[in-house]
Amino acid sequence: EQAPGTAPCSRGSSWSADLDKCMDCASCRARPKSDFCLGCAAAPPAPFRLLWP
């Protein structure tokens, strides 16, 4: 596993500062509050109109 600032995590994974390694975005289904889930594109952001009615 690479350190932050070097090569990015492989497709489908994201860096976890908490665990100090790349983690699978698939695990965000069970652990959505994990720090690395912010870096996962598993769920696209809500449309602008939903954020600002």
Epitope: G12, L19, M23, D24, A26, S27, R29, A30, A42
Partner: antibody
């Protein structure tokens, strides 16, 4: 290097009790859910119980066969997980493994501890 | 509970050839993005070891001879070319919901 050491197995009579222990090292124990999985020739690999994190209020989940008889617990200060087994039956005879999981995968397995329930 | 059915129960493959193991789930274990299926290897006298996670992602240190595929209810583990050290029993496992369940295992023998 990840290490998992199960202990506490042995021979016990039907209806008896036994407490299994697992000491872990080499990974951030407090951030991983912990599981007990057993293996027997009759039933193959069978998930038994899971305990989650302090932030989850140490939520526990059990296989139907373990509900009401088995209790999983953990001691984060000792990086240990336990399985208290009561009212043991012949069908509980198996090798018992502890295994950490972050979410979906049982990433590491110990060597297992053998439990035999027989009169 | 989700039932995982593995086939064949055992197979013998010549050194250097391909081994193919199937795992069928009684219901889908996939979202549109990920499949919640794992594969484990258990060599004789040893504990199980994680090989493949999320249907197709090799765990760290696992040789590229191993590959996984599938989605929904049908999953496959391929080993090519097989080596002597691949003599083992292989298990699939889902993490779609509780209880987690395992397949019955497939014993691979190298000829």
């Amino acid at each position: 290097e990840v290490k998992l050491g199960e202990s506490g197995g042995g021979l016990v009579q039907p209806g008896g009790s036994m407490k299994l222990s697992c000491v872990a090292s080499g990974f951030p124990f407090t951030k991983y859910w912990m599981n007990w999985v057993r293996q027997s020739p009759e039933k193959g690999l069978e998930w038994v119980a899971e305990i989650r994190l302090k932030s989850d209020n140490y939520a526990t989940h059990y296989a139907e066969s373990a509900k009401g008889r088995f209790t999983i617990s953990r001691d984060d200060s000792r990086s240990s997980v336990y399985l208290q087994m009561n009212n043991l039956r012949a069908e509980d005879t198996a090798i018992y493994y502890c295994s950490p999981t972050y979410a979906d995968t049982m990433d590491y397995w110990g060597q297992g501890t053998s439990v035999t329930v027989s009169s | 509970d989700i039932v995982l059915t593995q086939s064949p129960a055992s197979l013998a493959v010549s050194l250097g050839q391909r081994a193919t193991i199937s795992c069928k789930a009684s219901q889908s274990v996939s979202t549109s993005t990920y499949s919640y299926m794992q594969w484990y290897q258990q060599r004789p006298g040893q504990s199980p070891k994680l090989l493949i996670k999320y249907a197709s992602k090799l765990d760290s240190g696992v040789p590229a001879r191993f590959s996984g595929s599938g989605s929904g209810t049908d999953f496959t583990l391929n080993i090519h070319p097989v080596e002597e050290e691949d003599t083992a029993t292989y298990y699939c496992q889902h993490s779609w919901e509780l209880p987690y369940t395992f397949g019955g295992g497939t014993r691979l023998e190298i000829k």
